[in-house]
């Protein structure tokens, strides 16, 4: 109706003596601003005045002032959406209609809104799901129809008076649809809280009572057992009686069937609360309980091991591990079923007993070939000794042992003999499959376990070989010692240190790498003349005529070695220089004369000078000097001076003769 | 049984700060709200303030809402006192005491610290 | 904050005799759920308080029985039937009604 003024806010609202209430509020005027308001309590339209009359808990005025009288109630809106209000303190009699009187300057309304306060704080609401579990999450909601910003609450829960300290979610609502609040707790319970009592407990801002809501949870839950034996121990032996009995403790709804297992598997017919076990056997040993079900499922008691005692079965050994390797630890366990335990045990090796073996396990640290054979043993109990079982084999596993390499052939070897070894070996188990060599080479293998070296090398010094099954057994190397003839022959300089000139004393080495046999003897010879044969070549004080080609040689009892020839060169200064002319050293003027410069150095000479009668050098530097065209006034006496690295030589004077020719004399 | 364990003397210097203890055992610590309390000679008991160890909630007398700062730690079942700015004023026995939470009543108390402020 | 005022200040008495204390409020204990929470305290030199009385008359567990509370809105009293020498002490009374806590000054019981 577009007549009527718009408001929202709770119909009602809630609370106690002394505590506040907070009335959200919004209104829509229908024209205008607010100009009046009025609070009153249980207003009535007094219709000869056609005002309302009631206890005014609030007035607004014009000028917006309040009276003191008015500060426990408060208008908290605006003129034109908000009509919030408080009341702080609440009292009881606050309780009934509150009058909210609007005035605009046309228009008038009057909202009513219901205020409950009771005398003492009122109880939250606890809200539970329609079905509780057992071990299922389920959310416990506490509800409280109030919530005041000047006066702290809170919901505190309790199970069984003793406080819940599970995160606990408090939520307030303090809006125009709704005021509350509201404290929501997950819990997962368990079969143990069925009929155990939760509170929700009102609480004031120091944690103190004020009100509370209790309720009885109802957990579902499986049937929850007891079971009982006799005797109690449930200890018996072949032949005896054991009965056992099933009691529910806690079932919720009430149980519908039972039923007895044995080891897991239900047992046919038994589905009393008591099962009768007559003359029991060995068999019926195991783990018993017995199943109650009810609407929720299953629940199972506790498992009852019954123990029915028999003397030792025959037993069996249990090897860890066969086959077994040499050095490794080994366990046997002797195997036999008996109940109580066996407390004795006596162990066989090879049918003999072993002496101080008792135990269950016999344990051998370091396994050696000798423990391999059968192993058996015998348990005993309270109630007798067991039978001797058939036994388990151990195997121990070794390399080849004694692994040895043989040289087959007549000794000495010499160099390019054809040599075979063999490769043999005192026991091993597994057989021994293969063979290795050390060191590799393309030699040949005509059977397992020999080898053929065919052309032996100087430097076969040694061989070993491997017997080989899981594992490798090394032999130690055996030494060949192959003889050959002296190997790498060498002429060496041993002085001087640097090149050889005339005059020094030079010493010549003859060098090999090795010999086999070592007793050697040495020859030196030089073009084909023998020199010596000592192991050095001696030169006192060398001449230019000792150089040439020189070549050492070295046996033994196998053969002899020649060096390469090895060149000894000596250096020496310019000799033997003279002077030759050509054509002759009688020349016709006019003619042409070639002085030549004639010499033996080595290194060969590298600078000429040329010098006349008058011991003038010449300016000319090559070995020959050319004189054209030779004139009369060349005549007389030359010579000439070699120089190389080593030093200088000159030749002797050699005489020129120029004579006159036929047409000067005929001037004349 | 319940036991609340303190420390028996603090000495601090003027201006300094200092952090009492108070170890708890024989009970569900975070049941309980811990409240501490000052005992000065002749001048009787007052009440500090308390906390509630299981949400840390806090709430002080007015007289000591700049003095001091509750904390626990749920680990140890441990609750603490931080005294700052310390003057002659604050040399005290201080106690921590356990509230039971059916009568609001200080059912256990420690021994009490005896904090003295001097140079 | 609540005011609460114990007389007399020192109680001197012979073994064997009754003793009384009073503790007076300067607003009521009532609490809106309806219960008062005064208590009593003893505190022997160099031990702290050890709690006798909790909300009026409730005497806490290991208390022996010649202690007794009573009271109502804002006068209380503690009453020690016949007083042995372990009783010797200061007794406080306190109330946790309104926030601040409070206690009471303290009486000193000693031997006349």
């Known amino acids: 109706d577009s007549s009527k003024w718009v408001f929202e806010h709770p119909e009602t609202l809630y609370a106690w003596e002394g505590a506040c209430v907070w009335i959200p509020c919004t209104y829509r005027a229908l024209d205008g601003d607010l100009e009046s308001f009025i609070l009153f309590h249980n207003p009535e339209y007094n219709k000869n005045t056609s005002k309302f009359d009631g206890t005014r808990l609030y007035e607004s005025t014009k000028d917006g002032k309040v009276p003191s009288e008015q500060k426990r109630v408060q208008f908290l809106g605006d003129k034109n959406k908000n009509c919030t209000l408080s009341i702080h303190p609440v009292h009881l009699n606050d309780s009934g209609q509150l009058g909210l009187r609007m005035e605009s300057k046309t228009e008038k309304w009057m909202e009513r809104i219901h205020l409950n306060v009771s005398e003492r704080p009122f109880p939250p609401h606890i809200q539970l799901p329609p079905e509780i579990q057992e071990s299922q999450e389920v959310t416990l909601t506490c509800l409280l129809n109030f919530s005041c910003y000047g006066y702290p609450i809170q919901l505190q829960w309790l199970l069984e008076g003793v406080p819940m300290r599970q995160a606990a979610v408090t939520s307030t609502s303090l809006t125009i649809k709704s005021v509350f609040t509201r404290s929501e707790l997950k819990f997962s319970p368990q079969w143990s809280h069925h009929g155990k009592i939760v509170t929700c407990q009102l609480q004031d801002a120091d944690g103190k009572f004020l009100s509370n809501d209790t309720v009885q949870l109802n957990v579902k839950h499986t049937p929850k057992l007891e079971i009982k034996v006799t005797p109690s121990d449930a200890i018996v032996r072949e032949g005896d009686s054991v009965t056992m009995t099933c009691e529910v403790s806690s079932s919720n709804p009430e149980y519908t069937t039972v039923s007895w297992l044995k080891d897991g598997t239900s047992l046919k017919k038994q589905n009393t609360f008591t099962l009768n076990l007559r003359e029991v056997t060995k068999d019926q040993s195991g783990k018993y309980c017995c199943q109650v079900s009810n609407d929720v499922g299953p629940g199972r008691s506790e498992e009852v091991f019954l123990q029915v005692q028999y003397a030792p079965e025959p037993s069996t050994v249990q090897i860890l591990h066969s086959p077994a390797v040499e050095g490794s630890q080994v366990e046997f366990l002797c195997m036999s079923l008996a109940n109580p335990l066996p407390t004795n045990y006596t162990w066989y090796h090879n049918g003999k007993e072993m002496q101080g073996r008792t135990e269950e396990k016999v344990h051998i640290p370091k396994i050696l070939p000798w423990h391999a054979g059968t192993y058996s043993c015998v348990a005993e109990n309270i109630l007798g000794t067991g039978q001797r079982g058939p036994g388990a084999e151990l195997d121990v596993q070794y390399p080849p042992k004694k692994v040895t390499t043989v040289i087959q052939n007549p000794m000495p070897i010499r160099e390019g003999d054809t040599v075979t070894l063999s490769c043999n070996y005192n026991s091993s188990n597994p057989s021994v499959t293969r063979y290795e060599w050390k060191p590799h080479g393309a030699w040949e293998e005509p059977s397992l376990g020999v080898l053929k070296i065919q052309n032996v090398g100087w430097d076969n010094t040694t061989i070993a070989c491997a017997a080989c099954n899981s594992w490798c057994s090394w032999a130690s190397p055996v030494a060949l010692n192959v003889q050959y003839a002296p190997r790498d022959v060498r002429v060496r300089k041993i002085k001087p240190l640097s090149e050889i000139h005339s005059g020094n004393s030079v010493s010549l080495q003859c060098d090999f790498s090795s010999s086999h046999p070592k007793e050697v003897q040495f020859f030196w010879e030089k073009n084909g003349r023998l020199l010596g044969k000592e192991s050095q070549l001696n030169f006192d004080s060398i001449s230019p005529e000792d150089a040439g080609s020189y070549s050492c040689w070295v046996n033994n009892s196998i053969g002899q070695t020649a060096s390469k020839a090895w060149t000894l060169e000596v250096l020496y200064a310019p000799r033997r220089l003279r002077v030759s002319m050509s054509p002759g050293d009688q020349v016709m003027e006019g003619k042409s004369a070639t002085l030549t410069c004639e010499s033996d150095a080595n290194p060969p000479v590298s600078h000429y000078t040329w010098f006349d009668w008058n011991n003038q050098s010449l300016p000319y530097h090559s070995q020959k000097l050319r004189l054209e065209p030779v004139k009369v006034q060349h005549s007389g006496a030359y010579w000439c001076q070699g120089t190389n690295s080593v030093g200088k030589g000159r030749s002797p004077l050699s005489t020129l003769t120029v004579y006159y020719s036929p047409e000067t004399i005929g001037r004349r | 049984q319940v036991q609340l364990q303190q420390p028996g003397a603090e000495l601090v210097k003027p201006g300094a700060s200092v952090k009492l203890s108070c170890k708890t055992s024989g009970y569900t610590f975070t049941i309980y709200w811990m409240q501490w309390v000052k005992q000065r000679p002749g001048r009787g008991l007052e009440w500090i303030g308390r906390i509630d160890p299981h949400s840390g909630d806090t709430h002080y007398n007015e007289n000591f809402t700049t003095k001091v700062t509750l904390t626990v730690d749920e680990t140890s079942n441990t609750a603490y006192m931080h005294l700052s700015g310390l003057t002659s004023e604050d040399s005290a026995v201080y106690y921590c005491?356990?509230?039971?939470?059916?009568?609001?009543?200080?059912?256990?108390w420690g021994q009490g610290t005896s904090v003295t402020v001097s140079s | 904050d609540v005011v609460l005022t114990q007389t007399p200040l020192s109680l001197p008495v012979s073994l064997g005799d009754q003793a009384s204390i009073s503790c007076r409020s300067s607003q009521s204990l009532v609490h809106i759920n309806g219960d008062t929470y005064l208590h009593w305290y003893l505190q022997k030199p160099g031990q702290s308080p050890k709690l006798l009385i909790y909300t009026v008359f409730n005497r806490f567990s290991g208390v022996p029985d010649r202690f007794s509370g009573s009271g109502s809105g804002t006068d209380f009293t503690l009453k020690i039937s016949r007083v042995e020498a372990e009783d010797l002490g200061a007794y406080f009374c306190?109330?946790?009604?309104?926030?601040?806590?409070?206690f009471g000054g303290g009486t000193k019981l000693e031997i006349k």
């Open positions: 306190s109330q946790s009604t309104h926030v601040p806590y409070t």
């Open positions: 005491a356990r509230r039971d939470y059916s009568y609001y009543v200080l059912d256990y």
